[in-house]
């Protein structure tokens, strides 16, 4: 089917368009182009007649059109009036007509836009500003850019008039930015030059610098005032209410005690008509005063609070020094000095931060020291400890237990036996105990300042007979040649002897075996697989003796270098290959095979039926122990010969 494609469809004025013909018939008498959607002789543009072999212009020919051999029509120097439909009329050799219509649209090349504003100097928090993108152009889209970004979403920004107008309500100083507008149509896009919005604001409350308010007699006083303001503020200084001068800086050389007083800076914005003032009190000392330390927290809590120690007074051009425990400050990430060294901050205080702290002011000749300050760091209570550590007592003796928990302020203690409150003392004394005094002894420590409590429970057994002991271990699965194991004989009992047996024998002499803690603890250093034995501990006193159940040490080891069996390496074709791999290991290792580097199966036995010379190669067994994290392997070469080629070959399994 004959069709027309316009390239481009949207054409800019002054540019060109090609009406491209698709599926032009083969045998032609001629073809002709017309303006509009139908064939109309009065609107013929140009035609080509095969008979004359000439192109003939028609009434609608403007001199800007070119017809091509493929019947396509080029229109140059496009004008607005060219918009619309174009019809190609094709007459075939058999005089049958065909028609096709195409169209394009013409748009102007947009001019560079500009921004007009209804208010060149809006006042912050008071005025609105309306920007309008000029000129108004038909069929154009308007866009806005702020600092080369698309418009932010804000209830104070409003687009209107087909997006041609951008209104900023209640302008703020943050609206001081570069504004651009852009016009777009299907053939062009143009951006305006930027317009900088000049928002009048302020003055804000002025700041007087430097911040220090204490000076020494004879120094120069140099105060500077600044207030955020547009246009820049005009400044005035007053001392004790009396006007001094209209400058941003106030300079008084060689000050005396008489210069002490209130210093006021007034900032004025002539455009907004607003005034703001700030007052600072200046103290001039005749002599440098003895420094003293102020703290922002007199009772800081450990691991919770920070403490800021400040050296007073603040004096200009002064060097501040600090000492802790009569030493210069240690390097610590928890110690921070301010820029002027006047403030020492202890981040997340600990009980070790109590001090004493001293600060100093350096004069020309000497250093003036403050009195020392000690921090009262509240901490604890830590877990209380009950002493002595014995848990077994004989009837008839006195039971004297003492409780202690690190705490500031000191902890208050309470004792409970089997959950029943006994007394509010640090020590618990029971004379001439009997079996009935056996039970759970709880010490509770309480810190009244922090409100925290901590408890420790101890089981006391009163018995003439020693109990059956048990063995506790610090490592249930030690790794060979790496770990140590400490066995402890429980319980701890008064006036008791502790003994040890290994595999029913008394302890062998070995540098790897060590007794400690009154023989209660047996330590094996650098365990080996040979240490995997039965360990028994015994306790005895003048009345009785008892032994624990044996504890067998489970030593993790291996895998050792594996062994592949049978050892044969030569096989006859047709035999079965049945290789078994074994490695000493605890726990048992995982096995895997590789033939010529290619992974096979994860089994201990590798079986291949009816092998051929194709099965020649290297057979590797890999072992891994997940518990020790260790691996090992071995490689075996297998040769398979054709049947009957060589004597002495294994027939296989």
């Amino acid at each position: 089917k004959l069709t027309i494609e316009s390239t481009p469809f949207n054409v800019a004025e002054g540019k060109e368009v090609l009406l491209l013909v698709h599926n032009l018939p083969q045998h032609l008498f001629g073809y002709s182009w017309y303006k509009g959607e139908r064939v109309d002789g009065n609107r013929q543009i140009i035609g080509y007649v095969i008979g004359t072999q000439q192109a003939t212009p028609g009434p609608a020919y403007s001199g800007r059109e070119i017809i091509y051999p493929n019947a396509s029509l080029l229109i140059q120097n496009i004008i607005q009036n060219d918009t619309g439909f174009y019809t190609l009329h094709v007459i075939k050799s058999d005089l049958v007509n065909e028609e096709a219509t195409g169209q394009f649209r013409v748009y102007p090349e947009l001019p560079k836009p500009s921004i007009s504003s209804n208010n060149s100097k809006p006042v912050e928090d008071k005025d609105a500003v309306a920007f309008t993108c000029e000129p108004e152009t038909q069929d154009a889209t308007y866009l806005w850019w702020v600092n080369n970004q698309s418009l932010p979403v804000s209830p104070r920004l409003q687009l209107s008039n087909g997006n041609r107008t951008l209104t900023l309500f209640n302008v703020t100083r943050n609206d001081t930015a570069s504004y651009k507008c852009e016009t777009q149509n299907p053939v062009s896009a143009r951006r305006s030059d930027s317009v900088i919005l000049n928002v009048l604001y302020g003055p804000d409350a002025p700041t007087i610098s430097p911040l220090n308010t204490s000076y020494r007699s004879g120094e120069n006083l140099n105060l500077s005032c600044h207030a955020a303001s547009n246009p820049p503020a005009q400044y005035s200084w007053f001392v004790n209410g009396t006007f001094q001068q209209s400058t941003q800086e106030l300079f008084i050389p060689n000050i005396t005690v008489n210069n002490s007083g209130s210093y006021t800076c007034q900032a004025h914005n002539s455009d907004t008509g607003l005034n703001r003032t700030t007052v600072t009190t200046i103290t001039v000392y005749a002599e440098p005063p003895k420094p003293f330390i102020t703290s922002n927290n007199s009772n800081p809590v450990e691991d919770e609070d920070a403490v800021a120690l400040t050296c007073e007074p603040e004096i200009q051009n002064t060097t501040y020094l600090w000492w802790v425990n009569n030493q210069s400050l240690p390097v610590s990430p928890r110690l921070q000095l301010s820029n002027d060294n006047r403030t020492l901050t202890l981040l997340s205080v600990t009980r070790n931060d109590v001090g004493p702290y001293e600060c100093g002011i350096q004069n020309e000749l000497s250093v003036d020291h403050s009195d020392p300050v000690i921090l009262n760091v509240l901490y604890g209570p830590d877990d209380p400890t009950i002493s002595p550590s014995y848990t077994y007592y004989r009837p008839g003796v006195n039971l004297s237990l003492s409780c202690h928990a690190a705490s500031n302020p000191p902890a208050q203690y309470s004792w409970l036996i089997d959950g029943n409150i006994q007394q509010h003392t640090q020590e618990l004394f029971i004379s001439n105990i009997t079996e009935k005094n056996s039970g759970l002894y709880t010490c509770q420590a309480n810190n009244s300042a922090s409100g925290h409590s901590r408890t420790t429970v101890k089981t006391i057994t009163v018995s003439a007979e020693l109990p059956k002991p048990s063995i506790s271990s610090n490592n249930s699965k030690p790794v060979e040649d790496k770990d140590a194991v400490a066995f402890t004989c429980e319980p701890e009992a008064q006036n008791t002897t502790y003994l040890w047996w290994v595999n029913g024998q008394s302890l062998p002499v070995s540098p790897r075996l060590q007794l400690s803690n009154g023989n209660r603890t047996l330590t094996l250093f650098n365990v080996t697989r040979n240490d995997a034995r039965a360990y028994v501990c015994g306790i005895q006193n003048s009345v009785s003796a008892n032994r624990s159940d044996p504890v067998t040490l489970d030593v993790l080891y291996g895998p050792d270098t594996p062994i592949i069996s049978p050892p044969d390496s030569s096989y006859l074709s047709g035999a079965n290959l049945n290789l078994s791999c074994h490695s000493a290991s605890n726990p048992s290792p995982q096995y895997s095979w590789r033939i010529n580097g290619i992974p096979q199966q994860h089994t201990q036995v590798l079986f291949i039926a009816k092998i051929t010379p194709n099965n020649n190669g290297t057979y590797a067994c890999f072992v891994s122990n997940l518990a020790t994290g260790r691996n090992n392997s071995i490689v075996k070469s297998i040769t398979v010969s054709a049947s009957g080629t060589s004597p002495g070959l294994s027939a296989g399994a």
């Epitope: 083969q26 045998h27 032609l28 080509y48 008979g51 072999q53 192109a55 070119i66 017809i67 051999p69």
Partner: antibody
């Protein structure tokens, strides 16, 4: 592809006749006129005329009326230029060129005719 | 007949330079003007048609301008292969006359 293939060079004596061929391929021969252009050695191009390949009607430039004749063999997509009663001044290269109303877009390689006694 | 006056007949220029050739028609021909390049021993090749339009495959350093009776042809930044002959031709009416040609020579 579209091409015009011309016959080979000719060496003739004065008074003889020469007929040059121009065979078209790659397009519909009868849709485009065929031009003939002459170029004497070291000289510029001269338009001799054209033949309407659809009707067979020739048009000659004034200078080439009389001894020069354009003809067609439409079935063979071939145009011919015949020069009768050759003169020494007919020594030139003769080009055929396909006509589109705005340009000559396809040219033959040229046939050199040398007239010498 | 429409006469086409092409100038200059020859011009010397250096590689990288620009050259302009002009063609004057003895009567108005609209924009029905073509420019051709001819290399020694070869047939002419179409460069520009309709006074300003570049033929397919022709480098953009070639350009044409003008309408009515005065036409220009420009080559910007001459390459070595551009030092050959150039012809204008009117196709407004028969006879389709050529200009006398311009031979570009390397300086």
């Amino acid at each position: 592809q579209i091409q015009l293939v011309q016959s080979g060079p000719e060496l003739k004596k004065p008074g003889e006749t020469v007929k040059i061929s121009c065979k078209a391929s790659g397009y519909t021969f009868t849709n485009y006129g065929m031009n003939w252009v002459n170029q004497a050695p070291g000289k510029g191009l001269k338009w001799m005329g054209w033949i309407n390949t659809n009707t067979g009607e020739p048009t000659y430039a004034e200078e080439f009326k009389g001894r020069f004749a354009f003809s067609l063999e439409t079935s063979a997509s071939t145009a011919y230029l015949q020069i009768n009663n050759l003169k020494n001044e007919d020594t030139a290269t003769y080009f055929c060129a396909r006509l589109w109303y705005l340009y000559f877009d396809v040219w033959g390689a040229g046939t050199t005719v040398t007239v010498s006694s | 007949d429409i006469q086409m006056t092409q100038s200059p007949a020859s011009q010397s220029a250096s590689l990288g330079e620009s050259v302009t050739i002009t063609c004057l028609a003895s009567q108005t021909i609209g924009t029905r003007l073509a420019w051709y390049q001819q290399k020694p021993g070869k047939s002419p090749q179409l460069l520009i048609y309709a006074a300003t339009r570049l033929a397919d495959g022709v480098p953009s350093r070639f350009s044409g301008s003008g309408s009515g009776t005065k036409f220009s042809f420009k080559i910007s930044s001459l390459q070595a292969e551009d030092f050959v002959s150039y012809y204008c031709q009117q196709l407004y009416s028969t006879p389709y006359t050529f200009g006398g040609g311009t031979k570009l020579e390397i300086k």
